[in-house]
Amino acid sequence: TTELTEEKYEYKEGQTLEVKCDYALEKYANSRKAWQKMEGKMPKILAKTERPSENSHPVQVGRITLEDYPDHGLLQVRMTNLQVEDSGLYQCVIYQHPKESHVLFNPICLVVTKGSSGTPGSSENSTQNVYRTPSTTAKALGPRYTSPRTVTQAPPESTVVVSTPGSEINLTNVTDIIRVPVFN
């Protein structure tokens, strides 16, 4: 088994966490993906994609947006307007059933602290060089989401996943499992 190594990421309140989660294209392109937070030893599903996964059709749950790119083998997660209480351990997973999920390596240990200065969302963690192109030709800084699918917050689901390093389930080949990148 491969040991899960947590990666610590520090943000200020109001900033946006962007995560790029790679996955094996041939195996998981049509699978549902989910973003979950560990609460104790039980993961809580915060958002999950539709099935079959639609290319670049955002799924939005509150401040969380999931955008799956099955043509590219990549799931993008955005958590906007981060708050101190968002701090915790997060994972991208291939969501197959509430009791069975393929877990990412390198879970994200998110630490959100009170911002001391600057406007919310503006910092070294902000996305650079991005132009937002609405229906007009005007361009402004910052990403934009087109026609997000808003999902009413449902009662949290849980996946039974052992979070102890080295004891993850369904690891048949490490190249099949997506890895956690954090885009900051």
Epitope: K20, D22, F105, N106, T133, R179, V180, P181
Partner: antibody, heavy 116, light 107 residues
Framework: EVQLVESGGGLVQPGGSLRLSCAAS????????MSWVRQAPGKGLDWMAS????????YYVDSVKGRFTISRDNAKNSLHLQMNSLRAEDTAVYYC?????????WGQGALVTVSS | EIVMTQSPATLSVSPGERATLSCRAS??????LAWYQQKSGQAPRLLIY???IRATGIPARVSGSGSGTEFTFTISSLQSEDFAVYYC?????????LGGGTKVEIK
């Protein structure tokens, strides 16, 4: 089979302009991020620009920001790179690439030579 | 920007031997790392993404590993078609950046 065919390369004087085009086939163009990557003669690879499917996100490397413009026409399965205020250091083979973060499929490239 | 450094610049290996290439990032890129192969006069080809996931059609003798700032690319038994230049690339942060390349040549 994915095919990306670049056109529009050639010789241009410093300060001049050139528009590269890329004809895409063999995949759902409108579902894919696209990028331009260049390679100066005898040198390594340099990313230039990336564009989301619907054009809502566009990223540039600092060295071409304000001079180069990436655009796409999903109805025609085409990607473009408008290059203005060209400099000698822009001389390179320009590749049209499927993908926005990593580069999954490449065209054969279009040579752009900036010289007086 | 994140600077990617590859080593060695040139690697001389005999056919059938193992080739191990290194890539180091100036700051953590998690596992947002890809490897490409470029043969002389040809366009590059994606081999590995997500640090260890093989792209479509890439043989099992090719593998990648690492996370954070240190990455390794391995060809377990070099074939004639493997002699080429290899590049690593990070896609955690904009701008996307690539290493300077490692040339794998016949010993």
């Amino acid at each position: 089979e994915v095919q990306l065919v670049e056109s529009g390369g050639g010789l241009v004087q410093p300060g001049g302009s050139l528009r590269l085009s890329c004809a895409a086939s063999g995949f759902t163009f409108s579902s894919n991020w696209m990028s331009w990557v260049r390679q100066a003669p005898g040198k390594g690879l340099d990313w230039m620009a990336s564009m989301k499917q619907d054009g809502s996100e566009i990223y540039y490397v600092d060295s071409v920001k304000g001079r180069f413009t990436i655009s796409r026409d999903n109805a025609k399965n085409s990607l473009h790179l408008q290059m203005n205020s060209l400099r000698a250091e822009d001389t390179a083979v320009y590749y049209c690439v499927r993908g926005g973060w990593r580069f999954e499929s490449w065209g054969q490239g279009a040579l752009v030579t900036v010289s007086s | 920007e994140i600077v990617m450094t590859q080593s060695p610049a040139t690697l001389s290996v005999s056919p059938g031997e193992r080739a191990t290439l290194s890539c180091r990032a100036s700051q953590s890129v998690s596992s947002n790392l890809a490897w490409y192969q470029q043969k002389s006069g040809q366009a590059p080809r994606l081999l590995i993404y997500g640090a260890s996931i093989r792209a479509t059609g890439i043989p099992a003798r090719v593998s990648g590993s690492g996370s954070g700032t240190e990455f390794t690319f391995t060809i377990s038994s070099l074939q004639s078609e493997d002699f080429a230049v290899y590049y690593c690339q990070q896609y955690k942060n904009w701008p996307l950046t690539l290493g300077g390349g490692t040339k794998v040549e016949i010993k």
